[in-house]
């Protein structure tokens, strides 16, 4: 950190490595929960027009696709991978692509992905050719 920039206690707004280099924050689609027409497709665009700077540099991009008897929604947010989201760990946070994985949620079909390249949660991928691991 440059000498004229104050260091503050418990500062999670800045992340530095051992050499003092600074990590830039992620740029993610961030529309929270929106109704979606994405269904039975190998991949979908988020149709979220808001790209936001994540508040903390350690945060990654997340997308959550949910389908129940009434509707389909797609949630796009930033989130810290050290913390669970919707009670699930973000196992794929280092991935450059948002590869959807199904999670068990009663009463709905629930897929979630996370990724760490700019706006990577704009393109959500359901295709089995990308998804090599078993769903939880």
């Amino acid at each position: 950190i440059p000498p004229h920039v104050q260091k503050s206690v418990n500062n999670d707004m800045i992340v530095t490595d051992n050499n003092g280099a600074v990590k830039f924050p992620q740029l993610c689609k961030f529309c929270d929960v929106r109704f979606s027409t994405c269904d039975n497709q190998k991949s979908c665009m988020s149709n979220c027009s808001i790209t936001s700077i994540c508040e903390k540099p350690q945060e990654v991009c997340v997308a959550v696709w949910r389908k129940n008897d009434e509707n389909i929604t797609l949630e796009t947010v930033c989130h810290d991978p050290k913390l669970p989201y919707h009670d699930f760990i973000l196992e794929d946070a280092a991935s450059p692509k948002c590869i959807m994985k199904e999670k068990k949620k009663p009463g709905e079909t629930f897929f979630m992905c996370s990724c760490s390249s700019d706006e990577c949660n704009d393109n959500i991928i359901f295709s089995e050719e990308y998804n090599t691991s078993n769903p939880d």
Partner: nanobody
Framework: EVQLLESGGGLVQPGGSLRLSCAAS???????RMWWVRQAPGKGLEWVS?????????YYAKSVGGRFTISRDNSKNTLYLQMNSLRAEDTAVYYC?????????????????WGQGTLVTVSS
């Protein structure tokens, strides 16, 4: 020598406006994503806004979206931040910084060369 020189800060009343400038030299301005970053007294850094080198795509923190506008003039190697509807919580030192698009980390501990910053004080 790489230099970033911020200016335009000052004292403004709540609801007022300011325009910050950052004059860049010593590097190829059109190769870098540029950022405005701020630090309020006694607090950590907050990433305020960014703009792509070409095409002028812009990004904002949720705290300033709709109130602040980032822009750049590549012919003048200058970055701008138009700040409207200013609030007391916008009081901070504002810095500009440069980033190679797609690169996650700065090259060194000097944040790829910070400027000295410009102080914005919002108070009645």
């Amino acid at each position: 020598e790489v230099q970033l020189l911020e200016s335009g800060g000052g004292l403004v009343q709540p609801g007022g406006s300011l325009r910050l400038s950052c004059a860049a030299s010593g590097f190829t301005f059109t190769e870098y994503r540029m950022w405005w970053v701020r630090q309020a007294p006694g607090k950590g850094l907050e990433w305020v806004s960014a703009i792509e080198p070409i095409g002028n795509r812009t990004y904002y923190a949720k705290s300033v979206g709709g109130r602040f506008t980032i822009s750049r003039d590549n012919s003048k190697n200058t970055l701008y931040l138009q700040m409207n509807s200013l609030r007391a919580e916008d009081t901070a030192v504002y810095y500009c910084a440069k980033q190679i698009p797609g690169r996650k980390w700065t090259a060194n501990s000097r944040f790829d060369y910070w400027g000295q910053g410009t102080l914005v004080t919002v108070s009645s």
